[in-house]
């Protein structure tokens, strides 16, 4: 790479003569960071992105740049800044030494720092029989709306955009931010530079193998001709698109990220910036067989993040490793030995392995989806990808055990019509990120901003756990999961739903003195019971099991152990109905569920009783899962019986809206 | 707007060689390669091939192997198809067309070959 | 290479006629056809693309149908512009190839 330093010297003269005395310290009581990927071959020391504080107009974030480096040249250190931001997060890409950070850290406005690091495309005609539904034959694929009213965006390597399979359907921006290739002998073949992004754009809008046939896509060269790129040059295409968006808005946007690179802090916050402006994210969970939530972009809740599976609908292994999985990942999709385009030739196909692969099909069911309802949130998006997906076919014994709970057995499918979903009340369950083992830690789990947290359970692998609350935050209500004494750990789990117009609130019972155990009820005129949680301070609640369970005609109860706070999620929105649903064992048995019927949407899973032996409560779908301790190591057949407890709810409201449409 | 410009009427001896141009504009020629479709008098349409803007690569009908050329010159978006050996049957209008989906066409080039 | 037949290979039609021009391919070609017109000593003109999508600016009086092997265009009024000679081509496969063509003339 020919040094771009040559006018370094020009540029610090300049600002030596610049004016320069200005505070140092950063304003009180704030300590910027400075962050670096925890994977250190991927690593790009030397060049920083410096993010400002959130409200830091253009004009400062330049004056900032100019302070650090008439600061550096005053020290003697030579820097350039790259790239100023703005748009999405405001800052500034600089090249510099590393000794210079701790100055960096103390300039007015800086929220942070980090350092760039590389990212990697995530690639190594079943796929369309799998996500079409039924009454379609793949032979014959051609969806109802090709995507047309949407544009997808595609951050990747250069693409042959006059292939057959894309031609007239890609616009090749100039937008390009890559990194030199490694190596002195590396030789740049065109048809290799363009097989990542041209593979990936037949998989989204191929004529003949593509998901969404009418979509149009725009495509932004991230990745080099090696398939790498930076997490500086993705953040500046991110900015390109928020920037074109403003420009000359259309209609809704899709941006495929098909590339993942170690967790970032920055990215992740612009994949949130570009998500709240109405944008849909998709990107690959990673190659890495690894947890999904130690990569960025995936780890962004904002962003859809979608693992691969074969034909069989396992997870996909490559080579040694394979398809990311957890908590993380919002869905799985095709992608392994995938049909697109190739580059060697205008009309020529291969076969690609990867979540890359993975996330350009559900690129196109997204596109697909957004065709057919323009005005779907991305929080509405999500819902119904998760909705329509085939569940439980994926065999979990594939991911470490630590991991089965929390991987999403979900496998993306198009809608069997692309309208007519609206009546329906749809949950998705989130996990936290494990709470680490201290006597007090905690856990949270979060729903997206335009969704509601209609109910809150925990899950502790130990069995040592003290339940979990629902408590406002921010103005919004998260779900928190507590630890115990001796514990390894809990996970919050929160029941996040679509319900316009809900009005939520959340009523709590302190441990009850007599020996009934704890109840609460929504008092309110109109407010129904969505979800139960139980709390306590005592590290183990014994055994005690309350004599009834829940009076009869008083559907809107929660019941819970006398020595726990219990807490009822009550809701009122037009139409919304539930009813509580019991399914108790009397023997111990590891795991007890109970589903909610046809028509009716899970939005609460709580244990009764409360006990250590159980290790938690969790949603997966429309069942509520009820986990205890091995059956081996509980003591007697009395305290074994449990009994789980599901909230079933359906909106009348929302099934009349549907049949006006219709 | 979408424009493919060709160039004039040819009159060629029975063993000689052509070479027509079709010089485009009003889009981005990168995203499409051009198609030769050419028309003998009285007759019907017949595809000849595809050649790209991007990277040269090039795809001829078999009836064409090795006796015709596609090339393109990005830097004048132009692209030219090279017929040698020519015989009489190869009297024809020569068209060019925008892709493979060959949405918007040249006005024709009209190729006489006669001794 | 797929074989392209249209039929009727000429028609005469009066000012306000429907017309009705098919086209039959040797092999399934999906909903890959597309129909041009051409007038003497001009280029052909797309008309309708995959089947039965019409570019904007083509009138709506030419509609396209069908898939698998039989297709048709339809011309629901006819105009005075519109006598002219109308190719099918299938774009299934390389190499694409065309009908023989529907000459339409004036009664």
């Known amino acids: 790479q020919e040094d771009e330093d040559g006018d370094y010297e020009e540029l610090v003269l300049a600002l030596r003569s610049e004016e320069d005395g200005l505070a140092e310290a950063p304003e009180h009581g704030t300590t910027a960071t400075f962050h670096r990927c925890a994977k250190d071959p991927w690593r790009l020391p030397g060049t920083y992105v410096v993010v400002l504080k959130e409200e830091t107009h253009l004009s400062q974030s330049e004056r900032t740049a100019r302070r650090l480096q008439a600061q550096a040249a005053r020290r003697g250190y030579l820097t350039k800044i790259l790239h100023v931001f703005h748009g999405l997060l405001p800052g500034f890409l600089v090249k510099m030494s590393g000794d210079l950070l701790e100055l960096a850290l103390k300039l007015p406005h800086v929220d942070y720092i980090e350092e760039d690091s590389s990212v990697f495309a995530q690639s190594i005609p079943w796929n369309l029989e799998r996500i079409t539904p039924p009454r379609y034959r793949a032979d014959e694929y051609q969806p109802p709306d090709g995507g047309s009213l949407v544009e997808v965006y595609l951050l990747d390597t250069s693409i042959q955009s006059d292939h057959r399979e894309i031609e007239g359907r890609v616009m090749v921006t100039d937008f390009e931010n890559v990194p030199e290739e490694d190596g002195t002998r590396f030789h740049r073949q065109a048809s290799k530079c363009d097989s990542h992004g041209t593979h990936l754009a037949g998989v989204v809008s191929g004529r003949d193998a593509g998901v969404a046939k009418g979509a149009s896509m725009r495509s932004l060269r991230v990745l080099n001709c090696q398939g790498k790129g930076t997490v500086s040059g993705t953040l500046i295409g991110l900015e390109f698109i928020r920037k074109s968006q403003l420009v000359q808005p259309v209609g809704p946007l899709v941006v495929l990220l098909p590339l993942a690179g170690g967790y970032s802090r920055v990215l992740n916050a612009a994949c949130q910036r570009l998500a709240r402006a109405g944008v849909v994210l998709v990107t690959a969970a990673g190659n890495f067989r690894d947890d999904a939530c130690l990569y960025s972009p995936a780890s962004a809740p904002e962003v859809i993040t979608v693992g691969a599976t074969n034909a069989q609908d396992q997870p996909v292994t490559l080579g040694t490793l394979g398809t990311n999985f957890g908590r993380c990942v919002d869905l799985f999709a095709p992608g392994e030995d995938i049909i697109g385009a190739s580059s060697d030739c205008s009309t020529c196909f291969v076969s690609q392995s990867g979540t890359s692969q993975a996330a350009a099909h559900v690129a196109g069911i997204a596109a697909m989806m957004l065709s057919a309802e323009p005005e779907l949130t991305l929080a509405e998006l999500r819902q119904r990808l998760i909705h329509f997906s085939a569940k439980d076919v994926i065999n979990e014994a594939w991911f470490p055990e630590d991991q089965r709970v929390l991987t999403p057995n979900l496998v993306a499918a198009l809608p069997p019509s692309t309208h007519g979903a609206g009546w329906q009340l749809f949950c998705r369950t989130v996990w936290s990120a494990h709470s680490g083992p201290t006597r007090m830690a905690t856990a949270v789990a979060r729903c997206a901003p335009d969704e509601e947290l209609l109910s809150c359970s925990s899950f502790s692998r130990s069995g040592k756990r003290r339940g979990e609350r629902m408590e406002a935050q921010g103005g919004k209500l998260v779900c928190r999961a507590h630890n115990a004494f001796g514990g390894e750990g809990v996970y919050a789990i929160a029941r996040c739903c679509l319900l316009p117009q809900a009005n939520c609130s959340v009523h709590t019972a302190p441990p009850a003195e007599a020996s009934m155990g704890t109840r609460v009820h929504c008092h309110q005129q109109g407010h129904v019971l969505t979800g139960c949680s139980s709390h306590w301070e005592v590290e183990d609640l014994g055994t005690h099991k309350p004599p009834v369970l829940r009076p009869r005609g008083q559907p809107n109860q929660c019941v819970g152990h006398r020595e726990a706070s219990i807490h009822a999620s009550c809701c009122h929105a037009p139409g919304l109905e539930c009813k509580v649903k019991e399914h108790g064992i009397p023997a111990p048995q590891e795991q007890v569920t109970v589903a909610c019927e046809e028509g009716w949407t899970l939005t609460g899973c709580s244990a009764l009783p409360g006990t250590s032996h159980v290790l938690g409560a969790y949603a997966v779908d429309n069942t509520c899962v009820v986990r205890s301790r091995d059956v081996s190591t509980t003591g007697s057949t009395s305290e074994g019986a449990v009994t789980a407890v599901a909230i079933c709810c359906r909106s009348r409201h929302l099934a009349q809206a549907s049949q006006e449409l219709q | 707007q979408v424009q493919l410009v060709q160039s004039g009427a040819e009159v060629k001896k029975p063993g000689a060689s052509v070479k027509v141009s079709c010089k485009a504009s009003g889009y981005a020629i990168y995203n499409y390669g051009i198609s030769w479709v050419r028309q003998a008098p009285g007759q019907g349409l017949e595809w000849m091939g595809w050649?790209?803007?991007?990277?040269?690569?090039?795809n001829y009908a078999q009836k064409l192997q090795g006796r015709g050329t596609m090339t393109t010159d990005p830097s004048t978006s132009t692209a030219y198809m090279e017929l040698r050996s020519l015989r009489s049957d190869d009297t024809a209008v020569y068209y060019c067309a925008r892709g493979y989906v060959m949405d918007f066409w040249g006005q024709g080039t009209t190729v006489t070959v006669s001794s | 290479d797929i074989q392209m037949t249209q039929s009727p290979s000429s028609l005469s039609a009066s000012v306000g006629d429907r017309v009705t021009i098919t086209c039959r391919a040797s092999q399934s070609i999906n909903n890959w056809l597309d129909w041009y017109q051409q007038k003497p000593g001009k280029a052909p003109k797309l008309l309708i693309y995959?089947?039965?999508t019409r570019p904007s600016g083509v009138p709506s009086r030419f509609s396209g149908s069908g898939s698998g092997t039989d297709f048709t265009l339809t011309i629901s009024s006819l105009q005075p512009e519109d006598f002219a000679t109308y190719y099918c081509q299938q774009d299934q496969d390389i190499p694409p190839t065309f009908g023989q063509g529907t000459k339409v003339e004036i009664k």
């Open positions: 050649v790209s803007f991007y990277n040269g690569n090039t």
């Open positions: 995959a089947a039965s």
